[in-house]
Amino acid sequence: QDPWAAEPRAACGPSSCYALFPRRRTFLEAWRACRELGGDLATPRTPEEAQRVDSLVGAGPASRLLWIGLQRQARQCQLQRPLRGFTWTTGDQDTAFTNWAQPASGGPCPAQRCVALEASGEHRWLEGSCTLAVDGYLCQFGFEGACPALQDEAGQAGPAVYTTPFHLVSTEFEWLPFGSVAAVQCQAGRGASLLCVKQPEGGVGWSRAGPLCLGTGCSPDNGGCEHECVEEVDGHVSCRCTEGFRLAADGRSCEDPCAQAPCEQQCEPGGPQGYSCHCRLGFRPAEDDPHRCVDTDECQIAGVCQQMCVNYVGGFECYCSEGHELEADGISCSPAGAMGAQASQDLGDELLDDGEDEEDEDEAWKAFNGGWTEMPGILWMEPTQPPDFALAYRPSFPEDREPQIPYPEPTWPPPLSAPRVPYHSSVLSVTRPVVVSATHPTLPSAHQPPVIPATHPALSRDHQIPVIAANYPDLPSAYQPGILSVSHSAQPPAHQPPMISTKYPELFPAHQSPMFPDTRVAGTQTTTHLPGIPPNHAPLVTTLGAQLPPQAPDALVLRTQATQLPIIPTAQPSLTTTSRSPVSPAHQISVPAATQPAALPTLLPSQSPTNQTSPISPTHPHSKAPQIPREDGPSPKLALWLPSPAPTAAPTALGEAGLAEHSQRDDRWL
């Protein structure tokens, strides 16, 4: 396959993927494009990683170049070092591999330079102008685990189609990163959709075990029949429908005569008309039209309540006179103090809920605003054992205090940079600056992957702990795969996880909602279980967006209510500001703003190291900073950034003259 075909392609291993995007971009545009997908420009630091890049790029044309994640500031030559003064876009210079096209030449390095990889031959590294739009770019995506590609089965209609969290759709994967979806089409009819998920026993795996397509008989998936499957003599299947239903034109599904019936409330197939109408409890058929239902006034029934009765549409409620309490049966009254707790029964809510159709459920989800609902036990997973969405790196903080962000020491150059963290080869993203996301997840739309924020109970400030994720920092939350966020709201009953509506029969029992708990609630104390974090890591609050294939059968539909986390992001180096804000002190978190959406930049006065009036407190004097592309003004100033609603706004910076001199195209570091 020609890698220079119009479509991107990827090669994945058990812990990372490389993806080739044949799109003409400048270095800065390529860097942004990778970040928006949750990755970074490729950083092939080892011969093994380079080999994977080589196999992905293949034997391309000599005339084609691909950006990788190496850049160098002007006059930053260090020719004796392996990377010659270049820095990975993840912020460090660690490498066990280089592939320079030429030996280092002792020049003055007057200009900023970026590195592109030759598409041909040995894929040598060439340096050049960062503003050149080369032929494409290589992204790298790190994750905690991957699922092996599915084995082809005899009954499959074609190879499985995989969709990765970074939006690549292909049949050509050996490994699928956590959060990927596999769509399998069977010869015998309907196919299956599988999700690469975290397994309860540890590791990741497909959400459903094979075989997915058993053959042409009735055994796999009922032969594709909605109701009854009959195996014919020749081995093929024919479908039949149960009484009251008729076979649809596709020969597999069954049509419900009730679908078009004029019943106001409940319809049952059968009868002379093909259906009959019924009314819910609390209603009765209207005398003039049996299709309609009218409210039953239960209060007219003698003895329905011991004392007082209030009727309402679809139900009634019993009340007791002053000095009496309603008993547990919701009918009887007893003198006050005779029983422990007042109970009331709402037939409208408890007795009459007969499970509405999916359209009603959808509407209910649109109206859901973080409320909690008692649910029967869900077979998919115990609520107290959450399906861990593979946070590659989750810092831990004491429960009784807010997480601290590292600050630079006063004399620390350069003036615009963020704390650097150590490189971990298995998880690329931990070397990026970690940032509290300022983007708000929104409800899924046709162009936006769904977001699953978990809305958790309101807690005392002592117990408010953000859930930290570092898989895919610094990008709009709608693009982030496989991570759950937590914001705290109304207190639910203990062990009550947020509900996520789903239509995904391959994964969950019908009409049941999978649970995604990520905290354990006991009384008013929430304990979030997180592994340790080195002191120079800053927290990142983020959200999940699982990208699903538009064409996948039985596609997973995740519905959620948007949540909002107010923050006060600041420019690098991190500042604690004294400006007033609608945010309570417990939520005031100073963060590096290198990748925050730019909005309303406010210049702060320059601080000399010896005369600082702004409350900058150096807590990590030896922190280092990742190199993030920035626009390199003559003497950059610190800026206070406010969040912007634009989710993919690129990082921007201010030079000496503020915005007025900001050039239209600039490849200097942001």
């Epitope: 220079w4 005339s63 030449s105 900023q112 102008s129 503003t131 050039s663």
Partner: antibody, heavy 124, light 108 residues
């Protein structure tokens, strides 16, 4: 050594078409992109479009779109540029040039070799 | 389009002189600038690429500098064969090349 040899001068009437050739030698033809430029008398050079012999990928200057077509005969290591609906202001020297890929470890998109140019005169 | 303005348009100089030609871009082009020499009736020759890198075989008296919007070509000591037309080219928004109008070096 690398050479780009262009076809001879052309005189055309307004409304006619002209097809110029650029024969490459001394290097692997499919490894380098070929660009076409022109220079009208007393004017600066003007970029018209390019073709990548590796995959026949072409891009044209919007100013000429619809009038210019760049093609290849890979077996003959030759690039062609055809300009239709000629008008008097198309009178110019037309150049083909090879875009460099890398020099001494640097990638760059400057033109390292040029053809000698072809004068096209459009006159009624 | 990005406009390139060269100055001067004409220059009368003598052998041994130091010559500086400037090229201004209408917007930031980074270092994606090349300089060419063209003699009458001949094809242009590449002198400097990426603003400051001397092309293979070009004499050391030719040098380039600058980045962003301002670029210079310097000939440290003019030789008889250097009398020609010189023009700059930007390619930051490749493939949309644009060129300077040229500077003609004449013998005084």
């Amino acid at each position: 050594q690398v050479q780009l040899v262009q076809s001879g001068p052309e005189v055309k009437k307004p409304g006619a078409s002209v097809k110029l050739s650029c024969k490459a030698s001394g290097y692997t033809f499919t490894d380098y992109v070929i660009h076409w430029m022109r220079q009208a008398p007393g004017q600066r050079l003007e970029w018209m479009g390019y073709i990548n012999p590796y995959d026949d990928d072409t891009t044209y200057n919007q100013k000429f779109k619809g009038r210019v077509t760049i093609t290849l005969d890979t077996s003959a290591s030759t690039a062609y540029m055809e300009l239709n609906s000629l008008r008097s202001e198309d009178t110019a020297v037309y150049y083909c040039a090879r875009r460099g890929n890398s020099y001494d470890g640097y990638f760059d998109y400057s033109m390292d070799y040029w053809g000698q140019g072809t004068l096209v005169t459009v006159s009624s | 389009d990005i406009q390139l303005t060269q100055s001067p348009k004409f220059m009368s100089t003598s052998v041994g002189d130091k010559v500086t030609i400037t090229c201004r871009a209408s917007q930031n082009v980074g270092t994606a600038v090349a300089w060419y020499q063209q003699k009458p009736g001949k094809a242009p020759k590449l002198l400097i690429y990426s603003a400051s890198n001397r092309y293979t075989g070009v004499p050391s008296r030719f040098s380039g500098s600058g980045s962003g919007t301002e670029f210079t070509l310097t000939i440290s000591s003019l030789q008889p064969e250097d009398f020609a037309n010189y023009f700059c080219q930007q390619y930051t928004n490749y493939p949309m090349y644009t060129f300077g109008q040229g500077t003609k070096l004449e013998i005084k």
